[in-house]
Amino acid sequence: MATKAVCVLKGDGPVQGIINFEQKESNGPVKVWGSIKGLTEGLHGFHVHEFGDNTAGCTSAGPHFNPLSRKHGGPKDEERHVGDLGNVTADKDGVADVSIEDSVISLSGDHCIIGRTLVVHEKADDLGKGGNEESTKTGNAGSRLACGVIGIAQ
């Protein structure tokens, strides 16, 4: 079982970053940390998408990773996609320092995110509370600014 993973985020614009993942026990929480720069100030949706395919850019990554066929939600919600990691918050300099602990994603098993795509979005994720159908799918987070395939790290 992999205990560490890493993702290099890149896009067509200025957004780029490096995100690290660590899971000390197979059923334990995953620490997610790193930094993303080039963002506009404020909140940006942050999700693991289903496919590790970036052949046509971030669009090829498909929808949120959702092996349990649930509706979109926030990281604290029972009803959420496995890939729903919520939002990152960028400061006035466009930098989002990321530090999350999540107990739904994993680096092994059915909820394994390795080989899938991490995406940072144009707008805030409304955590499924937006009141429209798109909210229950994507959180109305808008376009995909940058992405990268999550790979095993040493």
Epitope: K31, G34, G74, N87, T89, I100, K129
Partner: antibody, heavy 118, light 107 residues
Framework: QVQVVQSGAEVKKPGSSVKVSCKAS????????ISWVRQAPGQGLEWMGR????????KYAQKFQGRVTIIADKSTSTAYMELSSLRSEDTAVYYC???????????WGQGTTVTVSS | DIQMTQSPSSVSASVGDRVTITCRAS??????LAWYQHKPGKAPKLLIY???SLQSGVPSRFSGSGSGTDFTLTISSLQPEDFATYYC?????????FGQGTKVEIK
């Protein structure tokens, strides 16, 4: 169950510095930001800044920039807030809190009273 | 910085009353607002996050609503332990900013 315990009350002279500690237990200290918030007598809550221990990166409110330093020691699960060039207006209760960004500050220390008096 | 303005600054109410506190942001913050309860000599306590989500362990008589610039905290039936000062906080942009507080006092 995450708990946060702060250091004891301090009495300081104007112009000096104070360093307040905030020790976390019962959870993963490094995975979350730690914010510092103060309340002066008869005043409201005021955010001073925060640190993400796993990254070591700190952000500060403009008002305190250059006078406050927030650091974290992952080995002891402790965050520190140092405020320099103290003046009487810095007399306040200083709180540290686990900061989950848009999810709010959900775990708070008991507060540390800092009195600045000549 | 985003300014947060609460009203009223204080309210006198009796046990069983419905109490409403409002908070206005100087610019749109979507639903990124938290509410706290603060009692003298105690640490603040998170009640509501994301404008309307109840923090775990908080009684259901507390509710939050609003988006954009105007937000409300409602206590449906005031209990003796609810007499305290309440603060809103925006979580949309750094620096985090709080309202000036609303003191709920016994009538």
């Amino acid at each position: 169950q995450v708990q946060v315990v702060q250091s004891g009350a301090e009495v300081k002279k104007p112009g000096s510095s104070v360093k307040v500690s905030c020790k976390a237990s019962g959870g993963t200290f490094s995975s979350y930001a730690i914010s510092w918030v103060r309340q002066a007598p008869g005043q409201g809550l005021e955010w001073m800044g925060r640190i993400i221990p796993i990254l070591g990166t700190a952000k500060y409110a403009q008002k305190f920039q250059g006078r406050v330093t927030i650091i974290a020691d992952k080995s002891t699960s402790t965050a520190y807030m140092e405020l320099s060039s103290l003046r009487s207006e810095d007399t306040a209760v200083y709180y540290c809190a686990r900061d989950q960004d848009y999810y709010g500050m959900d775990v708070w220390g008991q507060g540390t009273t800092v009195t600045v008096s000549s | 910085d985003i300014q947060m303005t609460q009203s009223p600054s204080s309210v006198s109410a009796s046990v069983g009353d419905r109490v409403t506190i409002t908070c206005r942001a100087s610019q749109g913050i979507s639903s990124w607002l938290a509410w706290y309860q603060h009692k003298p000599g105690k640490a603040p306590k998170l009640l509501i996050y994301a404008a309307s989500s109840l923090q775990s362990g908080v009684p259901s008589r507390f509710s939050g609503s609003g988006s954009g610039t105007d937000f409300t905290l409602t206590i449906s039936s005031l209990q003796p332990e609810d007499f305290a000062t309440y603060y809103c906080q925006q979580t949309n942009n750094f620096p985090w900013t709080f309202g000036q507080g609303t003191k709920v006092e016994i009538k």
